[in-house]
Interface confidence: medium
């Protein structure tokens, strides 16, 4: 399918690429001695980058700090020092740069203020950081300003005294709308959800918090939940974990109408030391992790139905450490339905698993062709690929980056990995899949930083080394052949690659510093690949590709979640620009239904390598109790339910019966007597 990756050998070298890149390499040296640098892109396709450098000297009583702010409007090729626009103020890096949603052009920087001041200070810009306005706040912010996703003029913030503050005019004026607030989040339609403590403090009242909602920015409120431990939003679902009446356990409740009605999720309850975590959520469904009792470092992934209520077991022994809160769960955004994560096996080793059907079935990642099994493998001929993600990074393996995929670079997944029976502590290599994780090939030897440009037309990589570097590698054929380019004669200590989010740009910025005897100087090199991809791609440069294709002879080949998709993909041999306006061209077609289109209903599970759902032994013969919209019901089922988002039609369709007994629900989470609405007077 593809040859082994090569670097400058057996590969057609691109003509004059060194001259073309040299003419398009721009150096910027930052004239300060800062210890840290943070970078933010402002807007989409604007070319505007803000760079904040900070230098802090901890003195005996106070710490002296200095910030510098730089702005580029050409994707990082040139920067202008605009520190004067923020009155040379020291900016608090823990709040970062709050960039407004979409292309609003809004930026908020939070300044450090002296101890005795009445409130904090921010610098606000609504013109892509061309100008800033200084605003003194009537409170000290505890969190970064949060923009409403629907209206970037609406902001909320929590104060250090747990007040909930709202601005309706992009931070010019602020109003405290509620006190004793623990957590606040924007919901849809400018709704604010927040928890309040009733007695003492957020920590002391955990499990006795109230969940409130305001739909009019604090004029009126409604209590939508009591005995709350915490809450979260995912897709169109609002989740709350609620303390049980009888003991110290808690359960997840779900609402799809912003908290007006709630249903008890069919998930195990958890004790004090356990946790729930929303791993991923979209408009159709949610992946929920439920921690195992005890400090095991693993739990179970459940996938929801389209109401977020009935859950089926998706993956056992899912690695999610309580200590560092690390999970390897990764949404492969370059192919629908694909997720990769890690499990903790019985011998305490860690193995990678992949699902191609949104959690319906998990399997090991296929061993890359021509690869050898490492020391972790019992059988030197049979093993699989294991992907390094957050947990490996937290355990200080030589893994500079998590897996990478981009929605507009169809099928491409890049990750560090090892080939064996489990994740190895050996120096990892970089692997690439061009079909969304079905097959893999070694892309680069040893650890690298990598990024995708021009919707997959170019992949760029830099070797991870503790020595100064001056070479960037790039590939125009999805990682098969690599060219090396020396971007500077003076090697730098590399700190990061920066390219515009969305992988549409053809510019890459290489950040680092040079160090002499006494000084450290920040420097960036921006390389523009536009002359490497000198022409625009045309119709003949693209070829049709059937996603999820594993058996070309089968009429159901490529069917995932009830439909198949054919994409137009750039040929590996074509060296041309997809361009900034490139839109992924795909053609969907509906498939007939089969067992693959159904998840196992509550109380059922699919044994490994089986398509039939079988009853969970502990529930055999029992009626299944569940709570829907505050009523207790009994569910009779043949064990299947359609996967949320599945579009299959006809074919096999196991029906499900739900018998509504309309008894009172065992959860009094939403006891109407506990409900109230009130105005903010």
């Amino acid at each position: 399918r593809r040859g082994a990756p090569a670097e400058d050998q057996d590969c057609g070298r691109l003509p004059d690429f060194i001259a073309k890149l040299t003419n398009n390499t721009h150096q910027h040296v930052f004239d300060d001695l800062s210890g840290s640098v943070s970078l933010s892109w402002v807007g989409d396709s604007t070319g505007v980058i803000l760079v904040l450098t900070t230098f802090q000297v901890p003195l005996v009583i106070v710490s002296f700090g200095q910030s510098k702010l730089y702005r580029s409007e050409d994707y990082g090729k040139n920067f202008k020092d605009i520190t004067n626009l923020i009155n040379n103020t020291f900016i608090r890096t823990e709040f970062g740069m709050a960039i407004g949603p979409e292309n609003s052009g809004k930026v908020i920087l939070t300044a450090e203020v002296s101890g005795g001041s009445r409130g904090g200070r921010v610098f606000r810009s609504s013109d892509f950081a061309k100008n800033f306005v200084q605003t003194d706040l009537p409170f000290h912010p505890l969190t970064q300003m949060m923009y409403s996703p629907q209206n970037s003029d609406y902001l909320l913030a929590l104060s250090t005294e747990n007040g909930l503050w709202v601005s309706k005019n992009f931070g010019e004026k602020w109003e405290e709308i509620h006190k004793a607030v623990c957590l606040a989040k924007w919901g849809p339609n400018n709704i604010i959800f927040f928890t309040t403590h009733v007695n003492g403090s957020c920590k002391a009242d955990l499990g006795a918090l109230e969940l409130w909602r305001t739909s009019d920015l604090g004029k009126t409120f409604k209590t939508i939940g009591v005995k709350i431990y915490s809450f979260g939003l995912g897709g169109r679902f609002l989740f709350a974990s609620v303390m049980a009446d009888k003991d110290t356990t808690r359960r997840i409740h779900v609402s799809t109408d912003q908290g007006d009605t709630w249903s008890m999720a069919q998930l195990p309850s958890v004790g004090q030391e356990q946790f729930y975590s929303i791993l991923a959520a979209n408009e159709d469904m949610v992946f929920m992790h439920v921690d195992e009792p005890g400090d095991t470092g693993f739990g179970t992934i459940f996938t929801s139905d389209d109401r977020g209520i009935v859950y089926s077991k998706s993956l056992d022994r899912h690695l999610y450490t309580t200590t560092g809160g690390e999970t390897d769960f990764t949404n492969v955004t370059s192919l629908r339905g694909v997720y990769i994560t890690s499990t903790l096996s019985e011998d305490n080793s860690i193995q990678s698993m992949i699902t191609f059907d949104q959690g319906g079935r998990w399997e090991h990642l296929r061993k890359p062709e021509n690869s050898k099994c490492d020391a972790t493998a019992k059988n030197k001929n049979e093993c699989s690929l294991h992907i390094h993600a957050s947990y490996s990074i937290s355990q200080k393996l030589n893994v500079p980056m998590a897996p990478l995929s981009e929605p507009n670079a169809v099928g491409i997944v890049i990750a560090h990995g090892s080939v064996g029976d489990a994740i190895s502590v050996m120096v990892p290599d970089v692997y690439i899949s061009d079909d969304g994780g079905y097959s893999w090939a070694k892309m680069l030897e040893g650890p690298h930083y990598y990024t995708i440009l021009d919707s997959g037309g170019i992949i760029v990589a830099i070797e991870h080394s503790n020595r100064p570097i001056n070479v960037i590698k790039f590939s125009t054929d999805e990682g098969q052949c690599w060219q090396s380019y020396v971007f500077t004669q003076e090697p730098i200590y590399f700190t990061g690659l920066a390219s515009e989010p969305g992988a549409r740009s053809m510019n890459i910025s290489i950040w680092g510093f040079t160090e002499s005897f006494i000084t450290r100087q920040w420097v960036s090199y921006t390389v523009d690949f536009k002359d490497i991809l000198e022409r625009n791609c045309e119709e003949d440069d693209y070829t049709t590709w059937l996603a999820h294709s594993t058996d070309p002879g089968d009429y159901k080949d490529g069917c995932i979640l009830g439909y198949k998709e054919q994409f137009l993909r750039l040929r590996k041999s074509s060296v041309c620009q997809n361009g900034r306006d490139y839109v992924v061209a795909k053609q969907p077609s509906v498939c007939p239904c089969s067992l693959e289109d159904f998840l196992c209903d509550f109380g059922y599970f699919r044994p490994e390598n089986a398509s039939e759902c079988v009853e969970q032994p502990e529930l055999k013969g029992h009626e299944l109790e569940f709570c829907l919209y505050g009523k207790e019901e009994h569910l009779t089922t043949n064990g299947y339910r359609k996967i949320p988002g599945d579009k299959c039609q006809g074919g096999m369709n196991p029906a499900r019966e739900v018998k509504d007994l309309k008894k009172k629900c065992t959860s009094n989470f939403l006891n109407p007597t506990k409900q109230n609405s009130k105005s903010n007077s």
Partner: antibody
Framework: QVQLVQSGAEVKKPGASVKVSCKAS????????MHWVRQAPGQGLEWMGW????????NYAQKFQGRVTMTRDTSISTAYMELSRLRSDDTAVYYC???????????????WGQGTLVTVSS | DIQMTQSPSTLSASVGDRVTITCRAS??????LAWYQQKPGKAPKLLIY???SLESGVPSRFSGSGSGTEFTLTISSLQPDDFATYYC?????????FGGGTKVEIK
């Protein structure tokens, strides 16, 4: 065969530092975590932490945080454990022990060094 | 941290005896337990891992059992070479912790 050979016994004064070495042979040094375990005279075993020889990453037990530094030199397949601000109750035999090739949440030890006695006395 | 408690701390036995040592964890550690033998002036030697799996080269008279919080090391017929101190170790999570040890001495 796998061998872990440690440096010789040391006598140190309170407040000083000690650096113990552990030379590995018979396997790929960078492919396995190296742990350090100590044992005070007549006492049980106490885990101190690990180093990942591949990346230099470390994980120390809370008790030793701030006093212990684990390093390695991959060119000579040697791991080091340095303990600073020594006290008399740091008198112990210090062992290096090899973990498995897998990334694990925690592990057991198949191979141990012979131990290095560190005596802290004024 | 997970505490590991071994009992007894000392055990007197004769050659040929069946010897049982117990190890208790302060919370469930599933089967993530190892047993070591240590002789004076020597490094510990791995006997059992994963509660009951015998390390290669270890005589079959050694066996381990248990899961959760209660574990046992059994020597079916004590041999002269077995007089030593035995330690259990949990490897369910960091920090790794050991039991206080059980000294098996000649009666």
């Amino acid at each position: 065969q796998v061998q872990l050979v440690q440096s010789g016994a040391e006598v140190k004064k309170p407040g000083a530092s000690v650096k113990v070495s552990c030379k590995a042979s018979g396997y790929t040094f960078t492919g396995y975590y190296m742990h350090w375990v100590r044992q005070a005279p007549g006492q049980g075993l106490e885990w101190m932490g690990w180093i990942n020889p591949n990346s230099g990453g470390t994980n120390y037990a809370q008790k030793f945080q701030g006093r212990v530094t684990m390093t390695r030199d991959t060119s000579i397949s040697t791991a080091y454990m340095e303990l600073s601000r020594l006290r008399s109750d740091d008198t112990a035999v210090y062992y290096c022990a090899r973990g498995g090739p897998q990334l694990r949440v925690a592990e057991y030890f198949q191979h141990w060094g012979q131990g290095t006695l560190v005596t802290v006395s004024s | 941290d997970i505490q590991m408690t071994q009992s007894p701390s000392t055990l007197s036995a004769s050659v040929g005896d069946r010897v049982t040592i117990t190890c208790r964890a302060s919370q469930s550690i599933s089967s993530w337990l190892a047993w070591y033998q240590q002789k004076p002036g020597k490094a510990p030697k791995l006997l059992i891992y994963k509660a009951s799996s015998l390390e290669s080269g270890v005589p079959s008279r050694f066996s381990g059992s248990g899961s959760g919080t209660e574990f046992t090391l059994t020597i079916s017929s004590l041999q002269p070479d077995d007089f030593a101190t035995y330690y259990c170790q949990q490897y369910k999570s960091y920090p790794i912790t050991f039991g206080g040890g059980t000294k098996v001495e000649i009666k």
